[in-house]
Amino acid sequence: EEELQVIQPDKSVLVAAGETATLRCTATSLIPVGPIQWFRGAGPGRELIYNQKEGHFPRVTTVSDLTKRNNMDFSIRIGNITPADAGTYYCVKFRKGSPDDVEFKSGAGTELSVRAKPSAPVVSGPAARATPQHTVSFTCESHGFSPRDITLKWFKNGNELSDFQTNVDPVGESVSYSIHSTAKVVLTREDVHSQVICEVAHVTLQGDPLRGTANLSETIRVPPTLEVTQQPVRAENQVNVTCQVRKFYPQRLQLTWLENGNVSRTETASTVTENKDGTYNWMSWLLVNVSAHRDDVKLTCQVEHDGQPAVSKSHDLKVSAHPKEQGSNTAAENTGSNERNIY
């Protein structure tokens, strides 16, 4: 009878993570008597995967009944495959012996490759908000995929971005890989409703890429524009001055009225109106009793937006055109939550 050969018919096997891998092995002879063992890797550091003779291998099942003498099929199944199981598996026949069994013949090996899906991409933006015309960086990360080949694209509102850098780690062979990409995005005043999307395509996703998103509303700060105007006289001695705060984002805003440099009133933006582009408008007004003033009044609308240094706009109120009532030093009554008389 010809000498036993160990046949591993599959040079390679590709399995999706979580599935079961079948590693095939047959012997050409029933002689010599002795156990079969499966190893991952070769040489002294090889890892025992299954021993026909003894041991507990909960993830491994045999395809046929290995307890029987007439069995020549030593194929095994390994359940719940993970990327860590990737490697070359050898089916090795031993000859029965004492004190130890003697390695007799090895199969040529079967390379197990594991297809593992990438994790959902996580997109993160800058720690601090930035204003339009500035360039900000977004990062996208995805982990745990195999094989290494992967495609990553960036989009802003459906338009593909080109200014990005991507790395896949590690560079060498590994059981699984990670991707890290940084994209540069130039902000515009219209970006409050914009989204940045990181799209990852991989062989395991069957043409249905994974996406991670970041809302530019978390990143952008649109500073307000201010306009102070004097409204027509409401009464003989009263002037209504308004401060229009336009096109700002986010909503966090505090307004202070100054009369000749002195704080008159401070208020926080509450009842704002939203523009189509997602920015906000707000208006504050003052009712000024001009008869309380001998000289011209410099009214300043000072706005602190989102913790940034204050911006302001001033308006000179001419008093000379309004004759004062003798002995009058009382202000007109407030007529609204954001109306204030100036004495």
């Epitope: 002689i31 008597v33 290995l66 029987k68 003498r69 007439n70 029965k96 012996g97 004492s98 130890d100």
Partner: antibody, heavy 118, light 107 residues
Framework: EVQLVESGGGLVQPGGSLRLSCAAS????????MHWVRQTTGKGLEWVSV???????YYAGSVKGRFTISRENAKSSLYLQMNSLRAGDTAVYYC????????????WGQGTMVTVSS | DIQMTQSPSSLSASVGDRVTITCRAS??????LAWFQQKPGKAPKSQIY???SLQSGVPSKFSGSGSGTDFTLTISSLQPEDFATYYC?????????FGQGTKLEIK
């Protein structure tokens, strides 16, 4: 059903010969090593001989040169030719299948009695 | 030849008892050791092979352990049908050899 049935035992004079047979059924006979084991009355078990799948043979020292094991795969039969029999060969003779992967015996026949006496 | 020594040669026990029989080889036999049960007038019946593997159809109350030269057979809860003679056998190298047997009797 897997079965082994021995035959050919009997009374024989010292120096005489006897041929034991073991008929196998219910399995692929050619794929197993086959053994003979004997048990003297009231005594323990003694392994006698084996014939491997490829026809290789081994014997216990006490029977070497006197006993010959053989097999006929086409008939699923095992044989033990016993020559120059001695009183010490008196025993129940069992055939056994090396049915486990490691050649451990898994199936035994019911045995056949061999008595060597004048 | 490898000598196999069993102890004790006889053992009295009661139904429900846990019993252990030991077998020692005169040299290292790896774990190529089998245990057989034999009742009067019957052929031996395989219980355990490769020191600890249960033969198909044998109840799990039987267990074996050991490697090298020292081996044990344990029956966890004796039933009336378990009273018999038990033999160990090394099948590491030819000639295969048996122990002299342990007779397990009802107390």
């Amino acid at each position: 059903e897997v079965q082994l049935v021995e035959s050919g035992g009997g009374l024989v004079q010292p120096g005489g010969s006897l041929r034991l047979s073991c008929a196998a059924s219910g399995f692929t006979f050619s794929s197993y090593d086959m053994h003979w084991v004997r048990q003297t009355t009231g005594k323990g078990l003694e392994w006698v001989s084996v014939i491997g799948i490829a026809g290789d043979t081994y014997y216990a020292g006490s029977v070497k040169g006197r006993f010959t094991i053989s097999r006929e795969n086409a008939k699923s039969s095992l044989y033990l030719q016993m020559n120059s029999l001695r009183a010490g060969d008196t025993a129940v003779y069992y055939c056994a299948r090396g049915g486990n992967w490691d050649d451990a015996f898994d199936i035994w026949g019911q045995g056949t009695m061999v008595t060597v006496s004048s | 030849d490898i000598q196999m020594t069993q102890s004790p040669s006889s053992l009295s026990a009661s139904v429900g008892d846990r019993v252990t029989i030991t077998c020692r080889a005169s040299q290292d036999i790896n774990n190529y050791l089998a245990w057989f049960q034999q009742k009067p007038g019957k052929a031996p019946k395989s219980q355990i092979y490769t020191a600890s593997s249960l033969q198909s159809g044998v109840p799990s109350k039987f267990s074996g352990s050991g490697s090298g030269t020292d081996f044990t057979l344990t029956i966890s809860s004796l039933q009336p049908e378990d009273f018999a003679t038990y033999y160990c056998q090394q099948y590491s190298t030819y000639p295969y050899t048996f122990g002299q047997g342990t007779k397990l009797e009802i107390k």
